[in-house]
Interface confidence: medium
């Protein structure tokens, strides 16, 4: 899916009301300085690839982080915001519902979401215009 | 490991223009911001301004708009730091600063040597 | 534009004392940093958004604060806490206060 056409300010204000807390959430007991940080993004669509990319395709050690409450708030925001973005989820939310049975917290997956902290910290980055 | 290495020491006249480089190595050059800020003798800190290598996009703190500009080369991995009509009050290192964003509010987390600036006449 | 007010610009005390290093915004602000430097050499990160310590700063060094009002802590001063600091912000521009040199009583 191509992030360039979302409604980017929508999005930043659905991730500061909520999704910045479920993620703190799931973090809780975790020290800020546990995870050194190696995914990136540039731009705020290569940073939302990035972020769906993280959130919802399971990765070894991790396959439990979609039915997350932060999980779910930001399909809800990327459907909302993103045009198009719902009917190129419907295949791949199939899949994810008979991959995943129980939600399972392991260290990967703490490690996985601080990238996702990382990654939604760079995508609310103040942007700079060419002047 | 990130580095950030600046140009050598300059000596200018009033009037004259300077321009520092800050040659970047150990992360991907345009996924971060990168600052420049300045220190007189003696004085505080000064932000001057700050760039995106990505999009070469800025932002310019109003005393010195107009007589700054900040540009990059992405493939040398380089920012710049011009500074034009120059006057004794300008003599101060200037750094060139990372702007991290692995912690909420933006900080400096990795910043150069420092290039000395000397205007006299 | 915010201005950033650092008091006191100089701190006098003893190795062993505590230090409280304050950052006034002429505007709220979300998050406050804190640098440290000692002569000659270029600014170091102390304290990212508000309370987070750099790595390597030691557990004796605290950061608090919100909207106006920011302070660094130091609970003992050791020999090589004293420099100066700076308190900055990047809500509007990226901005720093004046500085607070703790020097040795």
């Known amino acids: 899916y191509d992030f360039t056409n979302c409604d980017f300010e929508k999005i930043k204000a659905a991730y500061l009301s909520t999704i910045s807390k479920d993620l703190i959430t799931y973090m809780s007991g975790t020290k800020s300085t546990e995870f050194n940080n190696t995914v990136s993004c540039s731009n705020r669509p290569h940073c939302l690839t990035e972020i769906q990319s993280l959130t919802f395709n399971p990765t070894a050690g991790c396959a439990s982080l979609a039915k997350e409450m932060f999980a779910m708030k930001t399909k809800a925001a990327l459907a909302i915001w993103c045009p198009g973005y719902s009917e190129t989820q419907i295949n791949a939310t199939q899949a994810m519902k008979k991959a995943r049975k129980s939600k399972v917290t392991t260290n990967k997956c703490l490690e996985q979401v601080s990238q996702l902290q990382g990654l939604w910290r760079r995508f609310n980055r103040p942007l700079l215009k060419q002047q | 490991e990130v580095q950030l290495v600046q140009s050598g020491a300059e000596v200018k006249k009033p009037g004259a223009s300077v321009k520092v480089s800050c040659k970047a190595s150990g992360y991907t050059f345009t996924d971060d911001y990168m600052n420049w800020v300045r220190q007189a003798p003696g004085q505080r800190l000064e932000w001057m301004g700050i760039i995106s290598p990505y999009n070469g996009g800025t932002s310019y703190n109003q005393k010195f708009k107009g007589r700054v500009t900040l540009t990059v080369d992405k493939s040398a991995s380089t920012a710049y730091m011009e500074l034009s009509s120059l006057r004794s009050e300008d003599t101060a290192v200037y750094y060139c600063?990372?702007?991290?964003?692995?912690?909420?509010?933006?900080?400096?987390?990795?910043w150069g040597q420092g290039t000395t600036v000397t205007v006299s006449s | 534009e915010i201005v950033l007010t650092q008091s006191p610009a100089t701190l006098s005390l003893s190795p062993g004392e505590r230090a409280t290093l304050s950052c006034r915004a002429s505007s709220s602000v979300s998050y406050m940093h804190w640098y440290q430097q000692k002569p000659g050499q270029a600014p170091r990160p102390w304290i990212y958004a508000t309370s987070n310590l750099a790595s390597g700063v030691p557990a004796r060094f605290s950061g608090s604060g919100s909207g106006t009002s920011y302070t660094l802590t130091i609970s003992r001063l050791e020999p090589e806490d004293f420099a100066v600091y700076y308190c900055?912000?990047?809500?509007?521009?990226?901005?720093f206060g004046g500085g607070t040199k703790v020097e040795i009583k």
């Open positions: 600063a990372r702007e991290d964003y692995d912690y909420d509010g933006y900080a400096m987390d990795y």
């Open positions: 900055q912000q990047s809500d509007s521009g990226r901005e």
